[in-house]
């Protein structure tokens, strides 16, 4: 019994005069805007996006919207076309949804915010945006009260008219419409494809948060690792940073390239490499390989407990007003607009701490 290193877990609620607001990362579920896909993009990435077959032809499809098909047929006429250099990172950056077009309104603690308050970040969903990233010398925002008026409220247009037509199943095309959101500490990068939650158009979604500070014990009392980050890419250790680090190594090893959201200096994967290697290899790693990316728990971490609720937007009463305000049809408003409210439930944080049962 002397050699048993027991621990107990202490739970505490700590009142705070202010709390650091978390980073909020959001991604449109559509990776590339239809209007931004050029002839050259289509030539290089058309097969990856299931818009072309392997003979550079539009597949025989009965599912196509006539207007979109007409535009694509024109772009897919490659007679006498001379392909130009193509880079997936540049394609994601240029063709991804622009926060300046999506963001219809923004308020933090009642004060107006804007697209300038969102920092571009690349994830597996492509071009995404983080509010309150705490990077580029910007201070981390604080909140002094709980409740909806003391957090972030944004209204977004998800721009479904810009969604790529889906004529096949690929990792780069989505069956869904909406955004993915992750609420995370500024000390860890987003891992939104695995850890994000979905927010649908046609709804106002309320996310009530509670900050949780977790303190784990190292061996032999617990299993945490008081690691300093052994990484070329991230300053501080987190499970997320470790997993991104590991996924990057796995892809470079298997495919000799990296996806656009991965750090490092390996070349970006070409569309062909995405299709034949990077996408299936990463899917295999995430879904099947239980051993390659074993990331240890840090001894200190901050996470955010969340409770979600939703109401319909627009109401029948407001549909006409919103359509007029944003110069769109009522149908467009119903299919594209969402409101997201993120706030602290109360101004306290929870500590969950492992303590040695006896010294």
């Amino acid at each position: 019994y002397y050699f048993c290193y027991h621990h107990v877990t202490k739970l505490d609620e700590v009142a705070a005069s202010q709390l650091t607001f978390p980073a909020v990362t959001l991604c449109n579920l559509n990776e590339f805007r239809f209007s931004q896909v050029s002839k050259n993009d289509l030539y290089h990435a058309g097969e990856l996006l299931a818009l072309l077959n392997n003979r550079y032809e539009i597949p025989d499809t009965q599912m196509a919207d006539e207007k979109q098909l007409e535009i694509l047929q024109d772009k897919a006429n490659f007679r006498s076309f001379k392909p130009k250099p193509f880079n997936m990172r540049e394609f994601y950056d240029r063709a991804g949804h622009d926060i300046r077009d999506m963001l219809l309104s923004c308020h933090f603690r009642g004060e107006a915010c804007s697209a300038e308050d969102f920092k571009v970040v690349f994830t597996r969903y492509g071009k995404c945006y983080t509010f309150n990233s705490g990077q580029d010398g910007r201070p981390r925002l604080k909140t002094m009260k709980g409740g909806t008026g003391n957090g972030l409220e944004i209204m977004l247009d998800i721009q479904q008219d810009e969604y790529l037509p889906v004529w096949g199943e690929t990792d780069e095309t989505s069956f869904e419409a909406g955004i993915k959101v992750q609420i995370h500490s500024q000390d860890e990068p987003p891992f939104i494809d695995q850890l994000g939650f979905g927010v649908a158009p046609g709804f106002q979604t309320f996310v009530s948060c509670q900050e949780q500070r977790l303190i784990y014990l190292p061996s032999p009392w617990g299993t945490c690792n008081a690691v300093t980050m052994d990484s070329d890419f991230f300053d501080s250790y987190s499970i997320t940073a470790c997993r991104i680090d590991c996924e990057t190594r796995y892809l470079v090893e298997n495919c000799n390239c990296r996806m656009v959201h991965m750090p490092g200096d390996a070349p970006y994967c070409t569309p062909e490499q995405y299709k034949e290697c990077a996408d299936p290899a990463l899917d295999f790693l995430v879904e099947k390989d239980q051993e390659y990316c074993v990331c240890e728990m840090p001894c200190n971490l901050t996470r955010y407990g969340k409770e979600l609720s939703m109401v319909k937007i627009p109401s029948k009463a407001s549909a006409k007003y919103l359509a007029k305000k944003f110069n769109k049809s009522e149908q467009y408003i119903g299919e594209n607009i969402l409101v997201l409210d993120i706030f602290f439930e109360v101004l306290n944080y929870e500590t969950i701490e492992q303590k040695k049962a006896y010294e």
């Epitope: 199943e169 090893e253 299936p280 295999f284 879904e287 099947k288 390989d289 239980q290 051993e291």
Partner: antibody, heavy 116, light 107 residues
């Protein structure tokens, strides 16, 4: 270039033992699970056994459970299949394969014949 | 264990024909399915992985589709070199299993 080379096959009597080896090169061996697959003469392909990258996890087809043992030596980039209590129905070409998003390439195999 | 049922077992066809081989899994296997071609005395040769991705160097007349439990291998226009035995394999979960094979013969 990824390469796998099987060896150790041969003629053995029923009830006898044999140890197959697979030498791997061209990839970070310890990062990948490995499997053995066999094919009896004129028959189809049958998965036999698999082992995780660290060697900590092993899996077997029901037909060989309790008789075959898979192991690996990551320092030598080798995977092994120890076959005991061999039966006539174990006669086959044995291939080793790297488990990943695609199982490619395969070695040329090593032939095991169990006969008295 | 997941059973893989391949059909037909034997298929007679002529050069230029369009050929479809199907593979049905007894449980959902997502898209973790591969197709192999094998010729007598040779090791299996990978054609398609993750249900629909064409292995590098494999002619584009081969294509794969399906997800979940139903999968197909299509050869759009049969060539003399394509007469061989074809196997599907699920690598979604242990025990990894193969279909019983489809022997493609000259009619």
């Amino acid at each position: 270039e990824v390469q796998l080379l099987e060896s150790g096959g041969g003629l053995v009597q029923p009830g006898g033992s044999l140890r197959l080896s697979c030498a791997a090169s061209g990839f970070t061996f310890s990062s990948f699970a490995m499997s053995w697959v066999r094919q009896a003469p004129g028959k189809g392909l049958e998965w036999v056994s698999g082992i995780s990258g660290s060697g900590g996890g092993t899996h077997y087809a029901d037909s060989v459970k309790g008789r075959f043992t898979i192991s690996r030596d990551n320092s030598k980039n080798m995977v092994y299949l120890q076959m005991n209590s061999l039966r006539a129905e174990d006669t086959a070409a044995y291939y080793c394969a790297k488990e990943a998003y695609k199982w490619q390439p395969w070695g040329q195999g090593t032939l095991v014949t169990v006969s008295s | 264990d997941i059973q893989m049922t391949q059909s037909p077992s034997t298929l007679s066809a002529s050069v230029g024909d369009r050929v479809i081989i199907t593979c049905r899994a007894s449980q959902r296997i997502s898209s973790w399915l591969a197709w192999y071609q094998q010729k007598p005395g040779k090791a299996p040769n990978l054609l398609i992985y993750k249900a629909s991705i064409l292995e590098s160097g494999v002619p584009s007349r081969f294509s794969g589709s399906g997800s979940g439990t139903e999968f197909t291998l299509t050869i759009s226009s049969l060539q003399p070199d394509d007469f061989a035995t074809y196997y599907c394999q699920q690598y979604n979960s242990y025990s990894y299993t193969f279909g019983q094979g489809t022997k493609l013969e000259i009619k």
